[in-house]
């Protein structure tokens, strides 16, 4: 079956937006006014994953780019990266596990847990202009809560 997708932007709980930082990295910073146009638009695809009452498996691609957030081991540490894919084959219903995040939503606040590395979350730093990364702690200094804004297709 063809995969269902929605376009959206994400901001962390401090209202930092996500923008490209070089070809294969995202960073989080506060944007205002016309600068908001810099923020990346994600195509959130609803994919197959493990059954759970409160977790929805999604893949996060960059709209109209053949790039997906993925989770891999680098130097033995779970790491977030932007991975280039063949646009003829993606998105698809059965995404490889490294591309899958469990969307956990409570009161319109979203967390994105790596399906490949349970208890590791898409995270931002408190500091401005720092890379978006995969963090292994929740509720600490680093930010794991996001809000989502729909974007027209």
């Amino acid at each position: 079956a063809p995969v269902r997708s929605l376009n959206c932007t994400l901001r962390d709980s401090q209202q930092k937006s996500l923008v490209m930082s070089g070809p294969y990295e995202l960073k989080a910073l506060h944007l205002q006014g016309q600068d908001m146009e810099q923020q990346v638009v994600f195509s959130m695809s609803f994919v197959q994953g493990e059954e759970s009452n409160d977790k929805i498996p999604v893949a996060l691609g960059l709209k109209e780019k053949n790039l997906y957030l993925s989770c891999v081991l680098k130097d033995d540490k779970p790491t977030l990266q932007l991975e280039s894919v063949d646009p003829k084959n993606y998105p698809k219903k059965k995404m490889e596990k490294r591309f899958v995040f469990n969307k956990i939503e409570i009161n319109n606040k979203l967390e994105f847990e790596s399906a490949q590395f349970p208890n590791w979350y898409i995270s931002t730093s408190q500091a401005e202009n720092m890379p978006v990364f995969l963090g292994g702690t929740k509720g600490g200094q680093d930010i794991t809560d996001f809000t989502m804004q729909f974007v027209s297709s």
Partner: antibody, heavy 120, light 107 residues
């Protein structure tokens, strides 16, 4: 609590159009798909299409493309479905329903239905 | 389009009986399967979504299960208010499609 309140019954002549409304309360309108379903007299349920008010994404059943036009007004939390070029076979009860934007929860809430009768 | 073949089309049973209604999908629907109850002149009422998750407020005598592309609604002990028509729905792929319905009547 969640409520979907639909407009009242309509009687229309063949060839006319009708616009059915579905006014929503009790949840964040922009985050739920509004689904439209029809049921002809004594028949089963048939899916027409859906709209996500948050970004105006619309998906139609091919069978109803050109027949149904689905819209939403986020200022009034109301969704609409307009049916054009009505024929007797469009006589049916039309329902709106909802599903969360991530498709997880099924068509949980339903409007009471709007009977559209097409008769000369 | 995905076909949802629902059986039986009608069923007579008594209060206290255990009844099962089946829907067979013509292809994989990734567990995007709901069950509805409808009484004459009323809107459908959602019972179950994602195969087996009970909608809030629905009695626990209703349950859902799956085996491959076969999906089953079970009512463990029929109550007088359960006599109605039941529909399944796949919402995995456009167009979403309903089963033809099963009319559950008092024996």
């Amino acid at each position: 609590q969640v409520q979907l309140v639909q407009s009242g019954a309509e009687v229309k002549k063949p060839g006319a159009s009708v616009k059915v409304s579905c006014k929503v309360s009790g949840y964040t309108f922009s985050r739920y798909w509004i689904e439209w379903v029809r049921q002809a007299p004594g028949k089963g349920l048939e899916w027409i299409g859906e709209i996500l008010p948050g970004n105006a994404n619309i998906n139609y059943n091919e069978k109803f493309k050109g027949k149904a036009t689905i819209t939403a007004d986020t200022s009034t939390d109301t969704a609409y479905m307009e049916l054009s070029s009505l024929r007797s076979e469009d006589t049916a009860v039309y329902y709106c329903s909802t599903i969360y934007y991530d498709y997880d929860q099924g068509f949980t809430y339903w409007g009471q239905g709007t009977l559209v009768t097409v008769s000369s | 389009d995905i076909q949802m073949t629902q059986s039986p089309s009608s069923l007579s049973a008594s209060v206290g009986d255990r009844v099962t209604i089946t829907c067979k999908a013509s292809q994989d629907i990734d567990r995007y399967l709901s069950w509805f109850q409808q009484k004459p002149g009323k809107a459908p009422k959602s019972l179950i979504y994602r195969v087996k998750r009970l909608v809030d407020g629905v009695p626990s005598r209703f349950s859902g299960s799956a085996s491959g592309t076969d999906y089953t609604l079970t009512i463990s002990s029929l109550q007088p208010e359960d006599f109605a028509t039941y529909y399944c729905l796949q919402y995995d792929e456009f167009p979403y499609t309903f089963g033809q319905g099963t009319k559950l009547e008092i024996k």
